[in-house]
């Protein structure tokens, strides 16, 4: 039996019975491999005199798709596995009604993790084996009986690496605004030593705790537009691979030396973090190389010092902050931590104190942005191939996918009240959630204009009373006269218009004689041609950027760089009275029409570019013979 962990106890906590809100009534048929843990889940917790509603979403980006686990098999050999298609129970989200709230919890065996409301960080964990509905303790970090932990990174080691520290560098940014740069990704490799394994008792328990820790670290870094993705986990279940010393600086050196040797046969990662069960000397709980991210020294050591995994998560976030170039807040004159003073300090405070921090200070953010300007930081720009451990659609990603009626983003980001952002189904009582024929979540009546006529080759479209989308854009029948030409698939192509498009406002069609021969590769005039449907010949205007030209007398043709192909006169261009270019020849307008289409539209519509009837407002396709209201009444009018 593994020795029990000498966990610190809670001084003061509140007992709550979480209540899971019922999921969507319309349940999708999901493949059986998707496991027991839903994509989204909500819980109500009655704590500190409030009912907090937590909306959680599975952290699908927790593990990289090449995620590996390494451990020692019973026969003593080292085994590396790539777990496939596993479900997991690690969630992130927010608290309803609190704009800057955050939550990071596991639901594997009851609820465990944290949720933040304003400056209050609430920790939650099960008190018994009763699962998610059983008794849970909700408490604040300062009520954990624990000694203050400090970071072993000294001011001396920081000074030369970080440069001068002045308040002027740190211009406060509004607390809720994300940095406007692209998201950065830390591909993380975690090593768990034998002491930690002995304390937790099994590979499964270690895996669970590490995923919980990384889920929390990821949530803390999201405020900085960073994601932390676990690409590998190594568990020393048999023996340590190097000496883990109570002196954190020795242990860090050993970790980085070992990592350098292993790097060729293990994951290519951006950062390595050791989690140890060894009690570091004094109050130190973590130690890191400063500004080492993306280098061979990118790593840190972390003592698992608290009963709640949020403790070591905060330590790891802090040490990773050093790897990303951050200094301790108290070393920086004028550094601002937005936290309420009594609620504790920011993540880069030199010592944790009695409560766990939950945000980065202004100066940490400034150090980070400065680090990201270095060429060295390039390894953070590549998004890992994120494993969507659970296949199929993802509700909340702004894309409508299989089984979804709408997807307006996650609840905290959705502004469409016709869409239930938790289920990606229509909201209660809504007929529609999108489309120009959808108003106030209801389908507009038939005959309402939804797309006006743009120009003389366009046709206007009307709502049909059944569908939220405006009917497909349709155009005047090909061959309908337009300014200087004939309509063709909604355009009015003429030689003059084509030359202007390429050569600018001064471009014009070249003399008719320019069109009377074809051009061979190398700008050589060749055989005579009888029409103007060959190479597009222009004069005047500005030569288009990045295009080669072929000049013969006053005739200018655009060619490819190698001179083998020329810009042709486009299909549908007028080449004479009642004539258009069609399949490279000047042909009669009749090529567009196989029959007298408009005669089939019963005087309630016109023929469109597809040779189909385009009905006037309120009349039903395909032949505009009946009113839409009659058709709907006959078939049942619900959309």
């Amino acid at each position: 039996i593994a020795p029990s962990r000498p966990w610190a106890l809670m001084e003061q906590y509140e007992v709550v019975l979480p209540w899971r809100l019922p999921g969507p009534r319309v349940r999708r048929a999901l493949p059986s491999h998707l496991g027991l843990h839903p994509e989204r889940v909500s819980y109500v917790l009655g704590a500190t005199g409030h009912n907090f509603t937590l909306h959680l979403r599975k952290n699908r980006d927790l593990l990289g798709s090449g995620y590996t686990e390494t451990y020692t098999a019973a026969n003593g050999s080292e085994v590396t596995e790539q777990p496939r298609g596993q479900d997991h129970c690690f969630y992130q989200g927010h608290v309803e009604g609190y704009p800057d709230s955050a939550a990071s919890l596991s639901t594997c065996a009851g609820l465990r993790g944290f949720f933040q409301v304003g400056s209050d960080l609430h920790l939650i964990e099960p008190l018994d084996e009763g699962g998610e509905g059983g008794r849970h303790a909700v408490y604040q970090a300062e009520h954990l009986l624990q000694t203050a932990g400090t970071c072993g990174v000294s001011d001396d080691s920081l000074g030369s690496l970080l440069g001068p520290r002045t308040a002027a560098v740190f211009r406060p940014r509004p607390g809720d605004s994300l940095p406007s740069r692209e998201t950065r990704y830390v591909e993380l490799y975690v090593v768990v030593d034998n002491a930690e394994f002995q304390m937790l008792g099994s590979e499964a328990a270690v895996r669970h705790r590490v995923l919980e820790v990384v889920n929390h670290v990821d949530k803390l870094y999201q405020k900085l537009n960073f994601r932390v993705v676990l690409v590998g986990l190594e568990i020393w279940n048999s023996q340590d691979r190097f000496h883990v010393s109570p002196d954190p600086s020795v242990t860090l050196e050993n970790l980085l030396t070992w990592q350098a040797r292993q790097r060729t046969r293990r994951h290519l990662h951006d950062n390595v973090q050791l989690i140890t069960g060894v009690d570091f000397t004094g109050t130190t709980v973590g130690f890191a190389r400063v500004s080492a991210m993306c280098s061979h020294s990118s790593g840190a050591v972390n003592q698992d010092h608290s009963k709640n995994p949020v403790g070591v998560a905060c330590t790891m976030a802090h040490e990773m902050g050093h790897n990303l170039g951050m200094d301790h807040d108290e070393n920086v004159q004028g550094c601002r931590c937005q936290e309420r003073f009594e609620a504790g300090r920011c993540i880069m405070a030199g010592s944790i104190g009695s409560s766990f921090p939950r945000m980065f200070s202004d100066c940490s953010q400034a150090y980070l942005e400065s680090f990201l300007e270095r060429p060295q930081s390039v390894c953070l720009a590549n998004a890992p191939d994120l494993s969507h451990l659970v296949g199929g659609p993802v509700c909340g990603n702004l894309f409508v996918e299989r089984g979804e009626q709408c997807d307006c983003g996650p609840p905290e980001d959705c502004r469409n009240r016709c869409c239930n952002s938790t289920t990606c189904q229509l909201a209660e009582g809504a007929q529609c959630a999108h489309g120009t024929c959808c108003q106030e979540c209801k389908v507009k009546p038939a005959g309402e204009l939804c797309r006006p006529k743009k120009d003389m080759c366009d046709l206007e479209e009307f709502c049909d009373g059944r569908h939220p989308e405006c009917p497909e854009d349709a155009f005047q029948e090909n061959g309908t006269p337009c300014s200087g030409g004939y309509c063709y698939n909604g355009a009015c192509p003429t030689l003059a218009q084509q030359c202007q498009a390429f050569w600018g406002p001064g471009g014009q069609a070249a003399e008719e004689s320019c069109f009377s021969y074809d051009i061979l590769p190398g700008c050589k005039a060749s055989r005579y041609r009888a029409d103007m449907c060959g190479v597009l010949q222009c004069k005047g205007g500005q030569q288009p950027l990045g295009r080669a030209i072929c000049i013969v007398d006053v005739c200018h043709a655009l060619t490819t760089e190698d001179g083998t192909a020329y810009e042709p006169v486009p299909e549908g261009t007028r080449c004479g009275p009642e004539k258009v270019c069609w399949k490279g020849r000047c042909q009669d307008l009749h090529v567009y029409r196989s029959s007298n289409c408009s005669a089939q539209c019963h005087n309630h519509g016109v023929c469109n570019h597809k040779q189909e009837c385009h009905c006037h407002a309120g009349w039903a396709p395909p032949h505009c013979a009946k009113l839409l209201t009659e058709v709907h009444a006959a078939s049942g009018s619900l959309p």
Partner: nanobody, 124 residues
């Protein structure tokens, strides 16, 4: 009416990077979800990436995941598409489009405002 102007396209070697920008004017920028789309020669138009008005939610499609990143700066009314490890098959005209978030349901048809496009050519 929202006006959108794309920039940053050009010719690049395979494996190279480009950063496209989409600048908007005409309405409150943060009220609009922005999408990047592309149309390669002889191909259908396809979605590339989308980002919510706040910038909190962003998604790239499977074909570009891990190589392209979408972000926005609401103070500058601009959305960016950072394209790394470019491949010849990424050659296309790239368009940005805007959809009002109050009416957004996740469909291409929600994007009512479109830019003119910027050409990206990736040579091997």
């Amino acid at each position: 009416e929202v006006q959108l102007v794309e920039s940053g396209g050009g010719r690049v070697q395979a494996g190279g990077s480009l950063r496209l920008s989409c600048e908007a004017s005409g309405r409150t920028f943060s009220d609009y979800i922005i999408g990047w789309f592309r149309q390669g020669p002889g191909k259908e138009r396809e979605s590339v990436a989308r980002i919510s008005g706040s910038g909190l939610t962003n998604t790239t499609t499977e074909t570009v995941k891990g190589r392209f990143t979408i972000s926005r700066d609401n103070a500058k009314n601009t959305v960016y598409l950072q394209m790394n490890s470019l491949k010849p098959e990424d050659t296309a005209v790239y368009y940005c489009a805007a959809a009002y978030s109050g009416h957004f349901s996740g469909r291409v048809s929600d994007f009512l405002y479109w830019g003119q496009g910027t050409q990206v050519t990736v040579s091997s």
